[in-house]
């Protein structure tokens, strides 16, 4: 008799999940010579630790504590780049802005960009059909958790200025219950940040209108002026200006605003 | 098994540029960095850069940095490496290559090579 | 960048001597080394990595050694297959770099 298996509402475990995980450890470390010291393999057993095995509504951080120590990492904590609802661009940024990183520039935003995972409880089997949907199901999922784990201990390390990526598109250009919204505006550390800056990514190619004085984003400087951190905010009104002026600043066409 | 292979021989113009291919075979394109390295005639090898081809992400050689562009077709299981502004210089065998996670980072596969050869 | 200086260049020995060439890099690389047998219009083989690990299917008359910034390639007995080129690598930072070649020919 086939056992009774939970059906979430979230799609499941993306296929060759452990596979994926190793190889993309193994790869991170050849791009970064810096982590050659990392163990793939042991990465690779706290990974599989924080969840197998363990109901999938029931995940804690304590749970991904293994992976987040053998995953610890030093990036510079003054070339920190945050982002909301706009990933493409932001890592496009870091792509061509070498010394400035995003949180999946790091090993374990590497290992488990654009992945989902869940297992069973009292099982070693992942779960390749189904995964709890955060709204829907649970938010102390495994994915969920994780995000909220390794994006805490992101802003956390941020000092000095901390630039965030916003899409101006959006009808919440700053969502409170974004990861950036929920969890990395209320863990940057006042005693070390200095300043925010928010960069408003303009979607629309005559748009000139100030997003800057969106209310949402008053709601934002609001929130970190009660954290006693500076508030400043840029508009990017041609993205795709923008990446070719970081590619080549010295470009006749840079000095005008973009 | 695994095999990486690589577009035929091109002869170019002084300026012009050269788009050479590698089709990888036998193992999960996206599981492995591609390198490409090469080598002019009589000389030793040269490292150029290198690609993800899950994320696209790439780093060049300082020295091919402004005409070198190395991109990845995940549907094709395809490597390209376009050098543009070629100078005789450039005539050269190009060879794809990546590693295998068990040997360090040491290349232990190579595709058959490309020569590329500059004329005025 | 990180310099390999090779040597020597060229390298005449007969089948079954011993053979070693020698390797030097212009700072520490630790044992990210890989050393490479290549014959005319073919592609590099990778013989040993780690400095001093035998790759798949390399003959044990192979061997490596060394860390830091000396590195060596053995060949203990010469077979008539090995008259060919040979190239060591760093790996231990980008830009990865070969050094210039040792020419192992019959005498």
């Known amino acids: 008799v086939p056992r009774w298996r939970q059906q979430w509402s979230g799609p499941g475990t993306t296929k060759r999940f452990p596979e994926t995980v190793l190889a993309r450890c193994v790869k991170y470390t050849e791009i970064h010579p810096e982590m050659r010291h990392v163990d793939c393999q042991s990465v690779w057993d706290a990974f599989k630790g924080a969840f197998i095995s363990k109901h999938p509504c029931n995940i804690t951080e304590e749970d991904y504590q293994p992976l987040m120590k053998l995953g610890t990492q030093t990036v510079p904590c003054n070339k920190i780049l945050l982002w909301s609802r706009i990933k493409d661009l932001a890592h496009q940024f870091t792509q061509v802005q070498r010394d400035m990183f995003t949180l999946e520039d790091t090993l374990l935003g590497y290992l488990a960009d654009d992945l989902t995972w869940c297992g069973e409880f009292n099982t070693s089997k992942i779960n390749y059909q189904s995964c709890p949907d955060w709204r829907k199901d649970c938010s102390n999922n495994p994915v969920s958790v994780f995000w909220k784990t390794v994006s805490r201990r992101f802003a956390e390390a941020a000092c000095d200025v901390v630039h965030v990526m916003l899409n101006g598109s959006r009808s919440k250009i700053f969502d409170k219950n974004s990861t950036f919204g929920s969890v990395e505006v209320h863990n940057l550390q006042p005693e070390k940040v200095q300043t925010l800056e928010a960069w408003v990514i303009h979607g629309g190619r005559e748009d000139s209108r100030d997003l800057c004085q969106d209310p949402t984003i008053k709601e934002l400087e609001s929130i970190i002026s009660k954290r006693n951190i500076q508030f400043s905010c840029k508009n990017i009104y041609r993205p795709d200006k923008f990446l070719q002026c970081v590619k080549n600043p010295e470009d006749s066409s840079c000095t005008s605003e973009i | 098994q695994m095999q990486l292979v690589q577009s035929g021989a091109e002869v170019k113009k002084t300026g012009s540029s050269v788009k050479v291919s590698c089709k990888a075979s036998?193992?999960?394109?996206?599981?492995?960095?591609m390198h490409w390295v090469r080598q002019a005639p009589g000389q030793a090898l040269e490292w150029m850069g290198w690609?993800?081809?899950?994320?696209?992400?790439?780093d060049y050689a300082q020295k091919f940095q402004d005409r070198v562009t190395i991109t990845a077709d995940r549907s094709m299981s395809t490597a390209y490496m376009e050098l543009s502004s070629l100078r005789s210089e450039d005539t050269a065998m190009y060879y794809c290559?990546?590693?295998?996670?068990?040997?360090?980072?040491?290349?232990?596969?190579w595709g058959q090579g490309t020569l590329v050869t500059v004329s005025s | 960048d990180i310099q390999m200086t090779q040597s020597p260049s060229t390298l005449s020995a007969s089948v079954g001597d011993r053979v070693t060439i020698t390797c030097r890099a212009s700072?520490?690389?630790?044992?990210?080394l890989a050393w490479y047998q290549q014959k005319p219009g073919k592609a590099p083989k990778l013989l040993i990595y780690?400095?001093?690990s035998l790759a798949d299917g390399v003959p044990s008359r192979f061997s490596g050694s060394g860390s830091g910034t000396e590195f060596t390639l053995t060949i203990s007995s010469l077979q008539p297959d090995d008259f060919a080129t040979y190239y060591c690598?760093?790996?231990?930072?980008?830009?990865?770099?070969f050094g210039q070649g040792t020419k192992l020919e019959i005498k």
């Open positions: 690609i993800d081809p899950e994320y696209g992400r790439t």
């Open positions: 780690d400095a001093n």
């Open positions: 036998g193992y999960t394109f996206t599981d492995y960095i």
């Open positions: 290559a990546r590693s295998a996670h068990t040997t360090g980072f040491g290349f232990a596969y």
């Open positions: 700072e520490d690389i630790y044992s990210n």
């Open positions: 690598q760093q790996y231990n930072n980008y830009p990865y770099t």
